[in-house]
Interface confidence: medium
């Protein structure tokens, strides 16, 4: 839109654009006269002065009460109220490189950076965070303890969407064939607990065995799954008759 302060447009008096051009493309200044570089996020926009141009596509000019701290506004003695370009879409988006960007504008910036290095452009695959298969953040640890003790295994997993966590007991018959038993089954000395967190898209699960019996010895598997895949980690519970039977160093992570 034209401003009262604009006056007649004299293209010959327009300042030259940088020789290499503008990463976000060209637009016209606030008077609609001179070509200027399109403004990016956090850059000044609007106003009648020549050179105070319009925002790049996907951005809008918004009045800000703050000065541009440490940026050009404050340095140039700009006004207390400043209009800056902000991204219209302020929600996360998933890039074709599998990285989640806080906004479409940041994805576009990353894409232009990649292209400038001779790499492939990054495109938006979907709105929202990128989906990813589960991975085990903290696997369960092997446990050695005596009959009658109270023991627990814990497992922390992450994935997008948030994974579903289950526990299996791994059994091997005499011929070595492996099969799994979904826990807790009908065991009354065994409890399963799951909670969300501690971080976003994480789940933590526990198996509590109390009292511990010889039949509880074996391999326990924490299994996480979502629409993107699955992951699992296992730990052994070894049951002994007396504490002195527990080796002092039974591999890293072995605990009572």
């Amino acid at each position: 839109s034209s401003s009262d302060a604009c006056g007649p447009c004299v293209p010959a008096s327009c300042p030259a654009l940088p020789r290499l051009g503008c990463p976000l493309g060209e637009t016209r200044d606030a008077c609609g006269c001179c070509p200027v570089c399109a403004r990016g996020e956090g850059e000044p926009c609007g106003g009648g002065a020549a050179g105070r141009g319009h925002c790049a596509p996907g951005m809008e000019c918004v009045k800000s009460r703050k000065r541009r701290k440490g940026k050009a506004g404050a340095a140039a003695g700009g006004p207390a109220t400043l209009a800056v370009c902000v991204c219209k879409s302020r929600y996360p988006v998933c890039g074709s490189n599998g990285i989640t960007y806080p906004s479409g504008c940041q994805l576009r910036a990353a894409s232009l950076r990649a292209e400038s290095r001779g790499e492939k452009a990054i495109t938006q695959v979907s709105k929202g965070t990128c989906e990813q298969g589960p991975s085990i953040v903290t696997p369960p640890k092997d446990i050695w303890n005596v009959t009658g003790a109270k023991v627990f295994l814990s497992c922390e997993v992450i994935g997008i969407p948030t994974p579903v966590l289950i526990w299996n007991k791994v059994k091997r018959d005499h011929s070595g064939v492996q099969r799994t038993e979904l826990l807790p089954g009908d065991r009354e000395n065994l409890a399963i607990q799951t909670r969300g967190g501690p971080e976003k898209h994480e789940v933590t699960g526990w198996v509590l065995v109390s009292p511990l019996s010889k039949e509880d010895a074996g391999e326990y598997e924490c299994h996480a799954s979502n629409s993107q895949g699955q992951a699992s980690a296992a730990a052994k519970i070894t049951v002994v008759d007396a504490l002195h039977e527990i080796p002092l160093k039974k591999g890293e992570g072995a605990q009572l």
């Epitope: 570089c37 990016g40 340095a75 950076r113």
Partner: nanobody, 128 residues
Framework: SVQLQESGGGLVQTGGSLRLSCAAS??????????MGWFRHAPGKEREFLTA????????YYTDSVKGRSTISRDNAKNTVYLQLNNLKPEDTAVYYC???????????????????WGQGTQVTVSS
Amino acid sequence: SVQLQESGGGLVQTGGSLRLSCAASGRSFTFSSYAMGWFRHAPGKEREFLTAITWSGDYTYYTDSVKGRSTISRDNAKNTVYLQLNNLKPEDTAVYYCAAKFSQVSAFFATVSEYEYWGQGTQVTVSS
């Protein structure tokens, strides 16, 4: 006044790497208000523009002579711009200069006359 000080140059073998730094200082100099560029000057040749980065660090530009084997970056908190040079060749031997241009907007500057402040340069020698 504004000072730009390059460092990180030296003697390197063909195929080697170097990371050049350019530290900016000066009273009332707001580093994050400046677009930065790297140039080089080889004996008997004109000063050659290599790469540029916008004030925010969001956008970068590389000429064909260094594209794919160099990375420009900046740390506005440290008032420093960097140039990582990989797979160096004997023809990369030159004095490397950084330069600063006041710019409130995302724009690239490539000509010597567009830049306001220059460093003293750091020598890079690539031996075969």
